[in-house]
């Protein structure tokens, strides 16, 4: 069970609630496994993990990545633009997600954690938030064409994109995570 | 060199205030989180409080919470620990802490200053 | 608020001996840290993270353990390594810490 989805420490009847700080911290590393789980699926299927062809398959994806302007790292850390740069991000992610849940055979489960865990976490990063500028949300027409567009293409730039939204959301995760740490 | 230099230390009447400064060089401190952490005279650690690099998160203890206050001057790299309604078992030597870059860990420390309360 | 164990409290020891300090927590925690204290001086990080050794640390230092149980090993025991040693978790805040774990000199 996902941290934050009324997950029940068996071991440890007594447990306090999660601080706010804990079950984010908690939430990431959720999704991070489950990612792990993903790309070895994906890296025993084919051999898109030692590709070096994965610029002909990035011209079709716009995904989010961390830049210096974001604030995000230790150089030029600014921790209100940071947040926001994650929320932004995690919220355009979404529709990369939606597109893995039909891309696995034997990870399915995981995939649909990993995409339910996102949204947990956009929420508990939403309330962290609640002081800060309002946070813009992708069109959900934007979204529903680069959907179709994705589903479109043949095979190899399939498993191609799937690779890549799961390597550069393991990225992205593992930046927020280390600027989350100082919030 | 790293060097968090703590001050503001001293002897204090039960009920009364103080403000602890931990000045920050060698560094650049934008990036960085800060604790308090405490240590009665022979006894254990105790962790203060903390705050975010640009102080709009802070984090106290049950002990010190409504009573301390954590703040920061980015411009003259100082942190701050405001004391108000201070009781006798507060005394205790207050380490200010620097938070390692992407973990939460509490990397670099000051030399501490005394704090007494006691009438 | 977790609470964190040590044992043994104090140990006394001879150089080149290896010496292990265990730290039990109320519940499992996410993350586990080691810190070597002498008197009058602050806490020096020695461990992050239940295992990473810090940045200026001798190599015969080591940490491991998860869920509730760790261990902080000093490999062989040198003159200067006769301090008190303190494990800290965090898993939301607060902090906590051990009691400490006074290693003498036998």
């Known amino acids: 069970v996902p941290p934050g989805e009324d997950s029940k420490d068996v071991a440890a009847p007594h447990r306090q609630p999660l601080t706010s700080s804990e079950r984010i911290d908690k939430q990431i590393r959720y999704i991070l496994d489950g990612i792990s789980a993903l790309r070895k699926e994906t890296c025993n299927k084919s051999n898109m993990c030692e590709s070096s062809k994965e610029a002909l398959a990035e011209n079709n994806l716009n995904l989010p990545k961390m830049a210096e302007k974001d604030g995000c790292f230790q150089s030029g850390f600014n921790e209100e633009t940071c947040l926001v740069k994650i929320i932004t991000g995690l919220l355009e992610f979404e529709v990369y997600l939606e597109y893995l849940q039909n891309r696995f055979e034997s990870s399915e489960e995981q995939a649909r954690a990993v995409q339910m865990s996102t949204k947990v976490l956009i929420q508990f990063l939403q309330k962290k938030a609640k002081n800060l500028d309002a946070i813009t949300t992708p069109d959900p027409t934007t979204n529903a064409s680069l959907l179709t567009k994705l589903q479109a293409q043949n095979q190899w730039l399939q498993d191609m994109t799937t690779h890549l939204i799961l390597r550069s959301f393991k990225e992205f995760l593992q930046s927020s995570l280390r600027a989350l740490r100082q919030m | 060199e790293v060097q968090l230099v703590e001050s503001g230390g001293g002897l204090v009447q039960p009920g009364g205030s103080l403000r602890l400064s931990c000045a920050a060089s060698g560094f650049t401190f934008s990036p960085f989180a800060m604790s308090w952490v405490r240590q009665a005279p022979g006894k254990g650690l105790e962790w203060v409080a903390k705050i975010s690099p640009g102080g709009s998160w802070t984090y106290y203890s049950d002990t010190v919470t409504g009573r301390f206050t954590f703040s920061l001057d980015t411009s003259k790299s100082t942190a701050y620990l405001q004391m108000n309604s201070l009781r006798a078992e507060d005394t205790a030597v207050y380490y200010c802490?620097?938070?390692?870059?992407?973990?939460?860990?509490?990397?670099?420390w000051g030399q501490g200053t005394l704090v007494t309360v006691s009438s | 608020d977790i609470q964190l164990t040590q044992s043994p409290s104090s140990l006394s020891a001879s150089v080149g001996d290896r010496v292990t300090i265990t730290c039990s927590a109320s519940?499992?925690?996410?993350?586990m840290y080691w810190y070597q204290q002498k008197p009058g001086k602050a806490p020096k990080l020695l461990i992050y993270?239940?295992?990473n050794l810090a940045s200026g640390v001798p190599s015969r230092f080591s940490g491991s353990g998860s869920g509730t149980d760790f261990t902080l090993t000093i490999s062989s025991l040198q003159p200067e390594d006769f301090a008190t040693y303190y494990c800290?978790?965090?898993?939301?805040?607060?902090?906590?810490f051990g009691q400490g774990t006074k290693v003498e000199i036998k």
């Open positions: 993270d239940m295992s």
């Open positions: 519940i499992s925690v996410s993350y």
């Open positions: 800290m978790q965090w898993s939301g805040y607060p902090y906590t």
């Open positions: 802490a620097r938070q390692l870059w992407g973990y939460y860990a509490l990397e670099i």
